[in-house]
């Protein structure tokens, strides 16, 4: 006989998570990323909104900009000029797409404690940045680029052809912002500010997506966005460089496109300055399996940029597309010609390579059945990178240092044993010359940010440890989490299972699959989260599982490229396979299994529900893609090729959700979409709904008026409340 646990007072004070906790963000965490301004100094916005400068070596900190000054213009962001004379203050933030926004900018002169008057900046500005040295300003206003030598000077207009929705200078159009760069800017200062490079995007021939924005007016507005869907006309890109000291002297000079790229449709993928007179551009064929890295030099005699064929490096994939989600960027070494870059090795794992003359002669720096994920910094003697090597868990991230100053290079894991239980997923932020760095640990325990010495890796101080969150969670019954793997037909399926707090293997639980599953994504990660699915496990007693199947990242090209030209097949199969394995574990109620996903996950959940397996009782698709012909060219064609007869039209047609309308008859389906989704257009759900109606299949639906792909604000609360009711009804759980 075991003693009753009723009298355990600690157990009694514990409570389950509530939906309100999640919607209120009660258990959100903080991270600390220093805004580095030198090798040993950084800026940080204090809790009371003062901008404080910290000097690590002297241990001192002081306010450089008061909250009073910030408040005087309602500033929500700031940027210090490298010469430390001025600060720009950003206010009237107005979001556009994922990264882009417009804002009003004020320049504050630190030497006299006053705002710069005269030649004020126009408003609203689309992008603004300081030069890397001094206090020159480059900004984009109404799709044109302007330059100021000093904040109080009149501006010099660099481009004149900018036009809304037609020509974009220094900022990307919709598709380059979302799928290629992916940034809000498309201009780059040279290291000492001598030159400014920028992209011009010509969208004149791109078809336009138009949708209604209802607002409060009598007549809805129409939003028009040049948006190339699969197979459509794409933006035409050109790269220019201008001398910022004498901008009117020769004006912007165009950088030539490599001949093998220019012969057909192509993309520009990134620009990296090497020195003030050497620049590296990366280009990509429209069929995205060939990428060219081109190193160009400034010719003083002609005032032009020369990109010799001998400095072109080709990266090609024979089994899939070039790169992972994006083609990786080079990190140049101090000789200003050789560089480090991540690409697939001969065994099909993404690893760091050192390229000195040709890609064929590249020296492989890392190797193994794991992947190098990001190169953070290269110094004279060290290379810092992240990988998922440690203990063979693909969903972890640790930071490593390779000593490149000695031979053979030695490797050290900086983070593997720091806080092993708490921290298995790190990123890092380095000061100039990697004198110091911050580590930000995202989990699996409560996130923590720490400051470290760049030479010894010694921890100097804790920047943020989320003490309040730790205290707040003390009386919460959090679900248990497991990360394990299934081996099925030579495929490894990693999964994360979230289990109710009082989980008992001898009982039966409803199962919810949360899926994303897009190419080069990863859902099974060792990170901390208290979110909707945590609540569903904690309070509603559900088991939730996330599975990384074929097409997902960081486990080698075999898994990643398995979905090439065949989206919507193996991702779905692998979710189904995993569910069958979960049922075999004995604690899943096979009559109560659901699946849900958002975006690509909505596509996969829809196809899984319509797979005809009878495994799923119900499911939810939020903002799903329903046909790859409706989605963006850059993303879709990377994985699917073109929707033409002589390419891959057949699979474009076979992989739609609409083609499977009949199969929804025996499941409960909830379809959700925002009407102002600029990314996955409402068209996708409209077509699913039409096909279901035409097939006389019952389903549930919810639209969110004027909401985009993120369904933010009050819509979020409504969305999760609505989905909770739907799942509880499906699983026969009392309200």
């Amino acid at each position: 006989l075991r003693p009753s646990r009723v009298h355990n007072s600690e157990e009694n004070t514990m409570r389950a998570l509530t939906l309100k906790d999640i919607l209120n963000g009660t258990f959100s965490y903080k991270t600390f990323f220093p805004n580095w301004i030198s090798g040993q100094e950084y800026l940080h916005q204090s809790a009371d909104n003062n901008i404080v400068l910290y000097n690590i070596e002297t241990g001192q900190s002081y306010t450089i900009l008061s909250n009073r000054t910030m408040k005087s213009v309602n500033a929500s962001n700031y940027g210090l000029s490298p010469d430390r004379q001025f600060v720009y203050l950003e206010s009237d933030y107005s979001k556009l797409w994922r990264y882009s926004y417009t804002a009003t900018y004020y320049i504050y002169d630190l030497s006299n404690g006053e705002f710069v008057r005269g030649n004020e900046l126009p408003r609203p500005i689309q992008y603004l940045c300081w030069s890397p040295v001094g206090s020159k300003l480059a900004y984009v206003y109404q799709n044109n680029i302007y330059l100021k030598q000093r904040p109080g000077d009149p501006p010099f207009q660099i481009t004149f052809n900018g036009r809304e929705n037609k020509i974009f200078n220094g900022i990307p159009d919709w598709v380059y912002e979302e799928e290629m760069l992916p940034t809000k800017y498309a201009l780059w200062w040279s290291p000492n500010g001598k030159f400014l490079a920028y992209a011009e995007f010509n969208d004149k021939d791109i078809p336009v997506i138009a949708y209604s924005y209802y607002g409060d007016e009598q007549y809805p507005r129409t939003i028009n966005i040049p948006y190339p869907k699969a197979g459509a006309k794409n933006p035409v890109v050109r790269i220019f460089i201008i001398d910022t000291t004498y901008p009117a002297y020769v004006g912007p000079q165009e950088v030539p496109v490599p001949a093998m790229i220019a012969s057909s449709d192509y993309y520009f993928s990134w620009l990296t300055w090497v020195t003030d007179e050497r620049v590296c551009l990366q280009w990509l064929k429209r069929v995205q399996n060939v990428s060219v890295l081109s190193i160009c030099d400034f010719r003083e005699d002609w005032q032009t940029w020369d990109c010799p064929k001998t400095q072109e490096h080709i990266e090609e994939s024979r089994t899939g597309w070039a790169g992972g989600f994006f083609v990786s960027r080079p990190v140049f070494s101090y000789d200003a010609i050789s560089y480090y870059k991540i690409f697939s090795d001969k065994d099909g794992y993404k690893h760091i390579h050192y390229i000195k003359d040709t890609v064929e002669n590249a020296i492989q720096i890392t190797s193994g059945k794991w992947e190098a994920i990001n190169i953070f910094r290269v110094t004279q003697d060290s290379l810092f990178y992240s990988s998922n090597e440690f203990e063979e868990y693909p969903g972890r991230r640790n930071i490593y240092r390779i000593s490149i100053g000695s031979y053979p290079p030695s490797k050290k894991c900086v983070t593997c044993h720091l806080r092993k239980e708490r921290c298995q997923y790190y990123t890092a932020s380095f000061s100039d010359y990697a004198k110091y760095y911050a580590l930000v640990c995202y989990g699996p325990g409560i996130p923590i940010s720490t400051l470290h010495d760049g030479r010894t890796d010694q921890e100097i101080k804790i920047l943020e440890e989320n003490k309040e969150l730790e205290n707040a969670l003390k009386n919460i019954q959090l679900p248990k989490e497991e990360i394990k793997k299934l081996e099925v037909d030579e495929i490894t399926l990693w999964y994360k299972m979230i289990l109710p707090p009082q989980f008992d293997r001898s009982k039966k639980y409803p199962l919810l699959i949360q899926v994303y599953g897009g190419p080069c994504s990863q859902s099974v990660r060792s990170v901390f989260a208290v979110n909707w699915i945590s609540y569903l496990a904690s309070k509603e007693g559900m088991v939730i599982a996330l599975v990384d199947g074929r097409g997902t990242a960081f486990q080698g090209d075999k898994l990643l490229y398995a979905v090439y030209r065949k989206l919507g097949v193996y991702e779905v199969e692998d979710q189904i396979t995993a569910v069958r394995k979960f049922i075999e574990m004995g604690f899943i109620d096979e009559k109560r299994i659901a699946i849900w996903g958002w975006s690509y996950g909505g596509y996969v959940s829809s196809l899984a529900l319509a797979s005809g397996t009878g495994l799923f009782k119900c499911g939810i698709a939020v903002a799903p893609v329903s046909s790859w012909e409706y989605y963006a060219s850059v993303y879709t064609e990377r994985f699917m090729g073109l929707p033409t007869k002589d390419d891959n039209l057949e699979h474009y047609k076979n992989s739609t959700v609409m083609a499977r309308a009949e199969y929804f008859r025996n499941v409960d389906y909830l379809l959700i979409h925002g009407t102002a989704d600029d990314n996955v257009h409402f068209q996708n759900s409209a077509q699913i709904a039409k096909a279901l109606v035409n097939a006389q299949v019952d389903f549930q639906a919810m639209w969110y008026s004027d909401q985009n792909h993120g369904l933010s604000g009050l819509s979020t609360n409504h969305l999760y409340t609505h989905m909770t009711h739907f799942l509880k009804q499906c699983f026969s759980l009392s309200d």
Partner: nanobody, 117 residues
């Protein structure tokens, strides 16, 4: 509390030279990035020259090639060597952190430099 004590100013003929010193004491350290500023009569205070903690320097266009900022960490002192002085260099010269710290008592008394023609 930070104390900033500027000295070395004076009256000098155009074309002449002066060397300003600034001793930093209190809860501050001259190894921080430091700068010289100046304020002419009836004008706003402007930045003149700066030295970042790694030793690199920067100058306002008006003084480039004539003024040199340096420091001696052991003495907690920042210097401004001013050559080829012009009448328009006449001002009260101050030193401070770069960017300047704000708040009461964060500026010293300054040192007057007068350049006669």
């Amino acid at each position: 509390q930070v104390q900033l004590q500027e000295s070395g100013g004076g009256l000098v003929q155009a074309g002449g030279s002066l060397r300003l010193s600034c001793v930093v004491s209190g809860s501050f350290d001259s190894r921080n990035a430091m700068a010289w500023y100046r304020q002419a009569l009836g004008k706003e205070r402007v930045w003149v020259a700066g030295i970042i903690s790694d030793g690199s320097t920067n100058y306002a266009d008006a003084v480039k090639g004539r003024f040199t900022i340096s420091r001696d960490n052991d003495k907690n002192t920042v210097y401004l060597q001013m050559n080829s002085l012009k009448p328009e260099d006449t001002a009260v010269y101050y030193c401070n952190a770069w960017p300047p710290r704000i708040g009461l008592g964060s500026w010293g008394q300054g040192t007057q430099v007068t350049v006669s023609s």
